[in-house]
């Protein structure tokens, strides 16, 4: 059995996380998409798109904005004004049923720390883009994870684009998809 490899992203308070999830397959184009946070072993849906999705029709829930591009197979997630308590494990999912989601991407381990001054300054409002491509090494999330890969945040005034390496995945096998129960 294979494991989901989490990737660690470090931010300062006040910064913005931008994630682009690449779902590619047409069968997901009209499905609802969601951004979820793992709380213990259980995922919590923080925001989800409407159905059917429409291009450039953002859904905003507090500091989270979801924008689906079904004609291009992309979901854009933005979390603004990050706080220390936002730290945790997040995932893009295809939200198909009330109690089931299809997890197509390795989880993001978000670590938010206080800035040097302790409060976010205007120079810290940078965005780090995270590009997600489907995972072929996936199993239902359990209490243990493989060692995270740390992506060090660049100086606050810069914008960093972090791309998931490797070729796109040919999702021809439904075992490439993890089904995780959703409790909202």
């Amino acid at each position: 059995t294979t494991e989901l490899t989490e990737e660690k992203y470090e931010y300062k308070e006040g910064q913005t996380l931008e994630v682009k999830c690449d779902y590619a397959l047409e069968k997901y184009a009209n499905s609802r998409k969601a951004w979820q946070k793992m709380e213990g072993k259980m995922p919590k849906i923080l925001a989800k798109t409407e159905r059917p999705s429409e291009n450039s029709h953002p859904v905003q829930v507090g500091r989270i904005t979801l924008e689906d591009y079904p004609d291009h197979g992309l979901l854009q997630v933005q979390m603004t004004n990050l706080q220390v308590e936002d730290s945790g494990l997040y995932q893009c999912v295809i939200y198909q049923h009330p109690k089931e989601s299809h997890v197509l991407f390795n989880p993001i381990c978000l670590v938010v720390t206080k800035g040097s001054s302790g409060t976010p300054g205007s120079s810290e409002n940078s965005t780090q883009n995270v590009y997600r491509t489907p995972s072929t090494t996936a199993k239902a999330l359990g209490p243990r994870y493989t060692s995270p890969r740390t992506v060090t945040q660049a100086p606050p005034e810069s914008t960093v684009v972090v791309s998931t390496p490797g070729s796109e995945i040919n999702l021809t096998n439904v075992t490439d998809i993890i089904r995780v129960p959703v409790f909202n």
Epitope: K20, D22, E26, A29, Y69, P70
Partner: antibody
Framework: EVQLVESGGGLVQPGGSLKLSCAAS????????MHWVRQASGKGLEWVGR??????????YYAASVKGRFTISRDDSKNTAYLQMNSLKTEDTAVYYC????????????WGQGTLVTVSS | DIVLTQSPDSLAVSLGERATINCRAS??????????LHWYQQKPGQPPKLLIY???NLESGVPDRFSGSGSGTDFTLTISSLQAEDVAVYYC?????????FGQGTKLEIK
């Protein structure tokens, strides 16, 4: 291993019709859009059109040069895509390739070897 | 329609030297910061082969001397050290908008 095999090419007179087939194997055919691309001898590549999947209602899109004359269809039960060419013109003479993308608006990762269509009197 | 214009039309480069091919789009091929611009290599009598997808991603099995860059309307394919087997015609292609379109091709030869 993904394989795409075109067939049905040949010699046809101007104004005539021809139907090309693309037999696919090695992947879940119904999951992916299928495209046709052509290439006249010594010339560049020209995208002909595409057909999407059932979840996209088998929507089709065409290049302006073939719209109204060519029709793309698919039979998921036979893992086959088709290109019906009507009102053929001499300028339609080309090698016709069947291609498969990697998902919505993604790149053409897989190509057939092509089949030659010659329109001549 | 999006028109892709490649330059130069033909290129002669010495073995081991760098080869650069440009592709300019008549309008942006980007959506959500993704560039839907791809590069293919075609040798005589063969179907095209994917080299680079979405502007800068190297297709699996393609030598890392090939690289792609650019966004919006301007893109570049670079071969860092030309090898004899790289002699071919190279095409850029956009899939951001229907109809999909190809550049006219660039013929790469050995000097």
């Amino acid at each position: 291993e993904v394989q795409l095999v075109e067939s049905g090419g040949g010699l046809v007179q101007p104004g005539g019709s021809l139907k090309l087939s693309c037999a696919a194997s090695g992947f879940t055919f119904s999951t992916y859009a299928m495209h046709w691309v052509r290439q006249a001898s010594g010339k560049g590549l020209e995208w002909v059109g595409r057909i999407r999947t059932k979840s996209s209602n088998y929507a089709t899109y065409y290049a302006a040069s073939v719209k109204g004359r060519f029709t793309i269809s698919r039979d998921d039960s036979k893992n086959t895509a088709y290109l019906q060419m009507n009102s053929l013109k001499t300028e339609d003479t080309a090698v016709y390739y069947c291609t498969r993308d990697m998902g919505i608006r993604r790149q053409f990762a897989y190509w057939g070897q092509g089949t030659l269509v010659t329109v001549s009197s | 329609d999006i028109v892709l214009t490649q330059s130069p039309d033909s290129l002669a480069v010495s073995l081991g030297e760098r080869a650069t091919i440009n592709c300019r789009a008549s309008q942006s091929v980007d959506t959500a910061d993704y560039s839907f611009l791809h590069w293919y290599q075609q040798k005589p009598g063969q179907p095209p082969k994917l080299l680079i997808y979405r502007a800068s991603n190297l297709e699996s099995g393609v030598p890392d001397r090939f690289s792609g860059s650019g966004s919006g309307t301007d893109f570049t394919l670079t071969i860092s050290s030309l090898q004899a087997e790289d002699v071919a015609v190279y095409y850029c292609q956009q899939s951001n908008q229907d109809p999909y379109t190809f550049g006219q091709g660039t013929k790469l030869e050995i000097k």
